[in-house]
């Protein structure tokens, strides 16, 4: 008799989960010789402990603390650039200015970045059928609770000048309930950080609009300003020549507005 | 085959200065990370400082930080530590090593006493 | 005071297994690859056994390591009196941004 196995809304754990973080695990260190020491074997237990065996609706932060220990990546805390509904992008912006950092460039966010994952309640098994939806099942599921986790280690590691890449085709440039709105901006610490600064990234090649003056984008205004850090907007109407004069800065035609 | 040879070590004050020196051969120099570790008299190892290939980033001891500096030059094959405000807990062989691409240290030289003493 | 605690010496007779422990913390042992390096007076330190368990070779088959949690240690089976020796551990501490050794433990072959 097969054994009862609860049935979520969410796709189940990404197939082979276990061997892709182990991978990732060592080609991030491969890449990044500054993590050459770094045991992966030791970093998929910490993994695994933090969901096996547990119920996928009752994940805490504290059941990532053992895996966070490693989070002390150096990453420059300057260089650091957020996104909101605009993940590619972002990460090709990083590709090309390689001195600046997005979460899914640091070790930990490289090996879940798209991912899946969830255990079962008292088994030691990874459900590869489904795993909680953060709308339809709960919030507390071990991928929705691991981004909270570092996301929210992120922006507190943040100083200085602080970017952010929003999606200006969204009818919210600035969503309150993204990660960004709900865990990355209030976890920014006024001490250390002075400015954040807004890029807004246009989808129409014919939008000339200043998205910056978006009622969402001043109410993430308002609630940067009350946390007594500046707040400056930009917009990026061109993207791809964006990218282009990021690569090649000198380009004569890099110096007028993008 | 690999050798590494630390030359500079001698007697000087405490508040000196002191510049060692480790050249290397047998290897490409150039692609690897390099280290200083040293051994105060009657004690055990102790990580000093290490270098990284490419464009440079240094990494020091807290008890070394701000004192000395750790460099390279790739086009002599060469490692150096500059060793300022030199105090008595400074003395010791210091060692140079060549770090393998998962942080151990592969290959060593065979030291050069420094002695800070008044 | 070093970050990784290893006992000050151990002893064995000729052909007797030594075991050597190294314990330390989730910023060094736990998330790192362990080295242990043997180190004979007046010569170099020779590294032994990298990422935990490897040997570089050269290095006979009677030296072995193992890593659990926040601990490793070496074991030396057929002990020689060549053996005699320094042995540390050593592994990259998060917490200091740097490598951090135990304090060293003295291998003595008996009789």
């Known amino acids: 008799v097969p054994r009862w196995r609860q049935q979520w809304s969410g796709p189940g754990t990404t197939k082979r989960f276990p061997e892709t973080v182990l991978a990732r695990c060592v080609k991030y260190t491969e890449i990044h010789p500054e993590m050459r020491h770094v045991d992966c074997q030791s970093v998929w237990d910490a993994f695994k402990g933090a969901f096996i065996s547990k119920h996928p609706c009752n994940i805490t932060e504290e059941d990532y603390q053992p895996l966070m220990k490693l989070g002390t990546q150096t990453v420059p805390c300057n260089k650091i650039l957020l996104w909101s509904r605009i993940k590619d992008l972002a990460h090709q912006f990083t590709q090309v200015q390689r001195d600046m950092f997005t979460l899914e460039d640091t070790l930990l966010g490289y090996l879940a970045d798209d991912l899946t994952w969830c255990g079962e309640f008292n088994t030691s098994k990874i459900n590869y059928q489904s795993c909680p939806d953060w709308r339809k099942d709960c919030s507390n599921n071990p991928v929705s609770v691991f981004w909270k986790t570092v996301s929210r280690r992120f922006a507190e590691a943040a100083c200085d000048v602080v970017h952010v890449m929003l999606n200006g085709s969204r009818s919210k440039i600035f969503d309150k309930n993204s990660t960004f709105g709900s865990v990355e901006v209030h976890n920014l610490q006024p001490e250390k950080v002075q400015t954040l600064e807004a890029w807004v990234i246009h989808g129409g090649r014919e939008d000339s609009r200043d998205l910056c003056q978006d009622p969402t984008i001043k109410e993430l205004e308002s609630i940067i300003s009350k946390r007594n850090i500046q707040f400056s907007c930009k917009n990026i109407y061109r993207p791809d020549k964006f990218l282009q004069c990021v690569k090649n800065p000198e380009d004569s035609s890099c110096t007028s507005e993008i | 085959q690999v050798q590494l040879v630390e030359s500079g070590g001698g007697l000087v004050k405490p508040g000196g200065s002191l510049r060692l020196s480790c050249a290397a051969s047998?290897?490409?120099?150039?692609?690897?990370?390099m280290s200083w570790i040293r051994q105060a008299p009657g004690k055990g190892l102790e990580w000093v400082a290490s270098v990284s290939n490419g464009r440079p980033t240094t990494y020091y001891a807290d008890s070394v930080r701000g004192r000395f500096t750790i460099s390279r030059d790739n086009a002599k094959n060469s490692l150096y530590l500059q060793m300022n405000s030199l105090r008595a807990e400074d003395t010791a062989v210091y060692y140079c090593?060549?770090?393998?691409?998962?942080?151990?240290?592969?290959?060593w030289g065979q030291g050069t006493l420094v002695t800070v003493s008044s | 005071q070093s970050a990784l605690t290893q006992p000050p010496s151990a002893s064995g007779t000729s052909g007797q297994r030594v075991t050597i422990s190294c314990s330390g913390s989730?910023?060094?042992?736990?998330?790192?690859?362990v080295y242990w390096y043997q180190h004979l007076p007046g010569t170099a330190p020779k590294l032994l056994i990298y990422k935990n368990n490897q040997r570089p070779s050269g290095v006979p088959d009677r030296f072995s390591g193992s890593k659990s949690g926040n601990s490793a240690s070496l074991a030396i089976s057929g002990l020689r009196s060549e053996d005699e020796a320094d042995y540390y551990c050593a592994a990259w501490d998060d917490s200091l941004s740097g490598y951090v050794f135990g304090s060293g433990t003295k291998v003595t072959v008996l009789g």
């Open positions: 989730s910023s060094n042992i736990g998330f790192h690859f």
């Open positions: 047998g290897f490409t120099f150039s692609d690897d990370y």
């Open positions: 090593a060549r770090e393998g691409w998962s942080g151990e240290f592969t290959d």
